[in-house]
Interface confidence: low
């Protein structure tokens, strides 16, 4: 049974040219986090943090994405095109997959960095839970579906 919840930074805004930290936190579960995937609004992967293997930043983002803090991600040199949804996907064992959503609005430098309507939603429960059935074929450490497709 999936008892955990994902907390995210919710709706955030940042200045064009600046940087922002995308952060999710999994609570209320003892499940082991085997991997965290960070995806952009079009489902492109920005980065993966695997418990055993460390970080893999996808080359399309390597100039502008820094791993951390923790399991979070720092997005730098923001452009207006970075506005949109970001998803953290926590692959856990034995629970399955938890998913959180963050909406980032990149503002022109002339606009105040944090508008009130974004500020009020900081740290909402990011609410999308997905459960995948896993095939544990490598020593029972759990984690990802046995598939060649998207995760």
């Amino acid at each position: 049974m999936m008892t955990g919840t994902i907390e995210t930074t919710g709706n955030i805004s940042a200045k064009k040219g600046g940087s922002v930290i995308l952060q999710c936190h999994l609570s209320s579960t003892m499940a082991q986090v085997t991997q965290v995937n960070w995806e952009q609004h079009d489902h492109s992967l920005l980065a993966i943090r695997n418990a055993e293997l460390g970080w893999h930043i996808y080359p399309a983002f390597k100039d502008r994405v820094a791993p951390g803090p923790g399991l979070g991600l720092t997005l730098q040199s923001l452009t207006m095109n970075d506005t949109g949804e970001y998803f953290c996907t926590y692959h856990t064992y034995p629970d399955g997959t938890y998913r959180g959503r963050i909406f980032l609005e990149v503002l022109e430098s002339s606009v105040a960095e944090h508008s009130a309507r974004f500020q009020e939603n900081l740290y909402f429960q990011g609410l999308e839970h997905h459960h995948h059935h896993h095939h544990h074929h490598h020593g029972g450490s759990g984690g990802l579906p046995e598939t060649g497709g998207d995760r």
């Epitope: 079009d42 492109s44 992967l45 695997n50 996808y58 399309a60 998207d150």
Partner: antibody
Amino acid sequence: EVQLVQSGAEVKKPGSSVKVSCKASGYTFASYGISWVRQAPGQGLEWMGGITPFFNRVDVAEKFQGRVTITADKSTSTAYIELSSLRSEDTAVYYCARDLRRGGVGDAFDIWGRGTLVTVSS
Amino acid sequence: QSALTQPRSVSGSPGQSVTISCTGTSPDVGSHAYRSWYQQHPGKAPKLMIYEVSYRPSGVSNRFSGSKSGNTASLTISGLQAEDEADYYCSSYPPSSATVFGAGTKLTVLG
């Protein structure tokens, strides 16, 4: 069916250029990175570079920078590699390969073209 | 000289298990690099067998398994069959860096 269909074999003179194409079908072309990997006769695999069509982001291995141009035409779901200043050691089979995951280029390749033999000979 | 070192050849009899190693020899492809394994039959394109060290794409036999300890990743093929005879390549994709292939290992199925 997801597949990558490559252009036919080429014979080129040293110093010239060659352009190989790779037409994708069966999936959303723009979303997946396409890499180019070559294999000289009797030798191993060598990653040359790749492109993520959605971002038009190109990554080229250091060894090939300045000699390789990788492009993609989203309207025809086709990726291209052009190699200039050809020399005899560029004789190889050139493969295009699709990234396992959307958004990446150069991680793990789940779909491969059949390869294009490029022979460089005077 | 590849930054990934593989044995040139390994062999085994049908039904046996064989293991092919792949050791990262540079900091870039050290312990925090993702590894994949490819099978290539003569005259054919490579086929992805294992990715991210130990995950199998759909359609790949569960006789193929991957593991990693420190800088060395391993591909184990159990219940060896004649059709497993091929070249096997490991590859690494380190954080924010280029894909690297090992020089390849020729697997011979005896008898």
